[in-house]
């Protein structure tokens, strides 16, 4: 089975850990895929190690464990994330996480700095 937090939130500009926990008495994990909607983020292969999609390589760090650390979050990162565990023997197990990226607390408190144009 897959156990995960179904809904998580994080601040814009911050980072978040995406984590799925797989448990089985018999099946062994051969590979874990992480997707953002339909787009492949990263793959962990027992045989080959971690692969991070080049488009995310500056913001996605493998780990901890078989999870991902997603950095420099933007509002566009809000959405569904899926982990897929490929196991032997025993097939495929999937988990889903909804990530909500919120405005940073400074912005929400009205403390954001604005550039002012000189008068005159």
């Amino acid at each position: 089975t897959i156990d995960t937090k179904r809904n998580i939130s994080a601040e814009e500009g911050g980072s978040v850990i995406l984590q799925c926990h797989f448990s089985s008495d018999t099946a062994e994990v051969t590979q874990v895929d992480w997707k953002q909607q339909d787009q492949l983020l990263a793959i962990y292969s027992v045989d080959l190690g971690w692969h991070v999609a080049s488009v995310f390589s500056d913001r996605v760090v493998p780990g901890p464990s078989l999870g991902l650390t997603f950095q420099s979050l933007t509002m566009n990162d809000t959405g569904e994330y899926f982990c897929t565990y490929h196991t032997y023997p025993g097939g495929i197990y999937k988990g889903r996480i909804f990530l909500k990226v919120q405005e940073s607390s400074d912005d929400r408190n009205g403390l954001a700095q604005f550039q002012t144009a000189p008068l005159g």
Partner: nanobody, 125 residues
Framework: QVQLAESGGGSVQAGGSLRLSCAAS????????MGWFRLAPGKEREGVAA???????TYSDSVKGRFTISKDSANQILYLQMNSLKPEDTAMYYC???????????????????WGQGTQVTVSS
């Protein structure tokens, strides 16, 4: 983790044949796709052939009908049978592995992160 070692390269006359081998070691499950790439002096690395899940294969247009990729899954050995060789096939040939389920069985090298040391193929006219 997986290490790859190529062999079988050499010098051959145009029209001749060679069979390259790539032996994998250090694997636990052997669950990955494999491909052959080549690098000729002054040129960019070119995908030659790949074999993916379900035994699907793909070839570059430049070798289609002349080269055949195959895999001995029991022993984790990848082969490239090269027939009707041409001088333009001269290059260093590398095998590489990538995880399964990474899109189509294509020759894009971006998901290939595990590479062998290469074997030289020289075709003279």
């Amino acid at each position: 983790q997986v290490q790859l070692a190529e062999s079988g390269g050499g010098s051959v006359q145009a029209g001749g044949s060679l069979r390259l081998s790539c032996a994998a070691s250090g694997y636990k499950y052997g669950v990955y796709s494999m491909g052959w790439f080549r690098l000729a002096p002054g040129k960019e690395r070119e995908g030659v052939a790949a074999i993916c899940s379900g035994g699907r294969t793909t070839y570059s247009d430049s070798v289609k009908g002349r080269f055949t990729i195959s895999k001995d899954s029991a022993n984790q050995i990848l082969y490239l049978q090269m027939n009707s060789l041409k001088p333009e096939d001269t290059a260093m040939y590398y095998c590489a592995a990538r995880p399964l389920w990474t899109g189509d069985c294509d020759l894009s090298s971006s998901w290939y992160k595990t590479w062998g040391q290469g074997t030289q193929v020289t075709v003279s006219s």
